[in-house]
């Protein structure tokens, strides 16, 4: 990996061993304030592989609310507006980082956790295995 | 929101004010280790709105490497394998949390940051505005 020269003004680290505990400022800096509002929120309805969004809430996690996508159909919507089952609607999944309260119910102590979330759906051609 | 009864075994919090600084254990717990490998990594190629994945690296961020999707075409692939420009390939974007080293180059001090990433692409029907 890349070696980062250490800033002499860094806070002292108590524990140099893993599992590594670090200080994190929860005052979120949002880099997306100037992102284009055209990134349409209606893709879930206009897609040929449309999806619904479901609220996943967990008070022991930060962020406590995550929205998960669930494809509406097994197939994809064709030009006539019907479901074509020769194509497949599949969820696009991404691993994201969240903070899990550890020990449980502690407001100031967390552990990093990776979770897999479904962000939306896409239409794919099915894999067909031909027997020799 | 949901009130969480405080665990008496929680570490002491030095600073009760915002911006709130918390302790985070970076020894990541992966909740997805046993999810099925069938969540195919080849959707980017098989999709009717295929995409390429680009590596975005930033040593001041945790995770330092994030993969970003970029749609290959403006249109979508039709049944004949050609690009149909009457449909649109669009990126599905998601806001994710990352840790930004703050002050810069510090190994044990971070600030939460929200960034917008493109996870994959989906094929949508275009919005057509009819002029009166």
């Amino acid at each position: 990996g890349i070696t980062i020269p250490r800033n002499p003004g860094c806070p002292n680290s108590e524990d140099k061993n893993f599992p590594r505990t670090v200080m994190v400022n929860l005052n979120i800096h949002n880099r997306n304030t100037n992102t284009n509002p055209k990134r349409s929120s209606d893709y879930y309805n206009r897609s040929t592989s449309p999806w619904n969004l479901h609220r996943n809430e967990d008070p022991e996690r930060y962020p406590s609310v995550i929205w998960e996508a669930k494809c509406r159909h097994l197939g994809c919507i064709n030009a006539d507006g019907n479901v074509d089952y020769h194509m497949n609607s599949v969820p696009i999944q991404q691993e994201i980082l969240v903070l899990r309260r550890e020990p449980p119910h502690c407001p100031n102590s967390f552990r990093l956790e990776k979770i897999l979330v479904s962000v939306g759906c896409t239409c794919v051609t099915p894999i067909v295995h031909h027997v020799a | 929101g949901i009130t969480i009864p405080r665990n008496p075994g929680c570490p002491n919090s030095e600073d009760k004010n915002f911006p709130r600084t918390v302790m985070v254990n970076l020894n990541i717990h992966n909740r997805n280790t046993n999810t099925n490998p069938k969540r195919s990594s080849d959707y980017y190629n098989r999709s009717t709105s295929p995409w390429n994945l680009h590596r975005n690296e930033d040593p001041e961020r945790y995770p330092s490497v994030i993969w970003e999707a970029k749609c290959r075409h403006l249109g979508c692939i039709n049944a004949d394998g050609n690009v149909d420009y009457h449909m649109n390939s669009v990126p599905i974007q998601q806001e994710i949390l990352v840790l930004r080293r703050e002050p810069p180059h510090c190994p044990n001090s971070f600030r939460l940051e929200k960034i917008l990433v493109s996870v994959g692409c989906t094929c949508v029907t275009p919005i057509v505005h009819h002029v009166a």
Epitope: E68, R72, L74, V117, V128, V131 | R31, T35, R39
Partner: antibody, heavy 126, light 111 residues
């Protein structure tokens, strides 16, 4: 270790009720898993009862099971349940809990069941 | 509901034989079909999903084919551990939120 463990089976009288539990370990219900119940009468074939989506709570049932059988889940306990009412002698079977093979946001449990519990025997008899 | 008809219901074969089991759906389920193997006193084991995709860890002598209403499970060269009962299962859901999950009657494969 990833596993499913059923419990709650036993002897019940005709007309009685029973609630079976299926505790999952090694994976979390956080997100979309389809958890299903399947039964097998002694010496007979497999019979699908129904499934629940742990993400949004949507349930799917075999037509014969609607009304008498109810599937629910408690994500905080990583457990799914099968509530069986108005039990009859023909409901005597080994009841299996199983997980659909595909994780995360598919429209239906369409990928087969890759993880099964050991089964719990339910006997309906007077 | 969709009916799944499996044939034959029983089959005798020898080690090394090529064996074919068929499954017919009462209406099209496209490629939404799974195959399972079950041994006495054990839970079923998923072999194939989406008609032809082999589950991780399943030997390549097992293969599946078909779409629509007609499906086939083939064991290219029978091994002693393959003697068991085999089931097909539909996994098809439609846009009207009707979901069809039905097992075939099973095929008992004996020596």
């Amino acid at each position: 270790e990833v596993q499913l463990v059923e419990s709650g089976g036993g002897l019940v009288q005709p007309g009685g009720s029973l609630r079976l539990s299926c505790a999952a370990s090694g994976f979390s219900f956080s997100g979309f898993y389809y958890m299903c119940w399947v039964r097998q009468a002694p010496g007979k074939g497999l019979e699908w009862i129904g499934c629940i989506d742990t993400g949004d709570g949507t349930t799917y049932y075999a037509s014969w099971a609607k009304g008498r059988f109810t599937i629910s889940r408690d994500n905080s306990k990583n457990t799914v349940y099968l509530q069986m009412n108005s039990l009859r002698a023909e409901d005597t079977a080994v009841y299996y809990c199983a997980r659909d093979a595909a994780y995360g946001g598919y429209a239906y449990p369409a990928h087969g069941m890759d993880l099964w519990g050991q089964g719990t025997l339910v006997t309906v008899s007077s | 509901d969709i009916q799944m008809t499996q044939s034959p219901s029983s089959l005798s074969a020898s080690v090394g034989d090529r064996v074919t089991i068929t499954c017919q759906a009462s209406e099209s389920i496209y490629r939404y079909l799974s195959w399972y193997q079950q041994k006495p006193g054990k839970a079923p084991k998923l072999l194939i999903y989406l008609a032809s995709t082999l589950t991780s860890g399943v030997p390549s002598r097992f293969s599946g084919s078909g779409s629509g209403t007609d499906f086939t499970l083939t064991i290219s060269s029978l091994q002693p551990e393959d003697f068991a009962t085999y089931y097909c299962q539909s996994n098809f859901g439609t846009a009207s939120t009707t979901y069809y999950n039905t097992f075939g009657g099973g095929t008992k494969l004996t020596v």
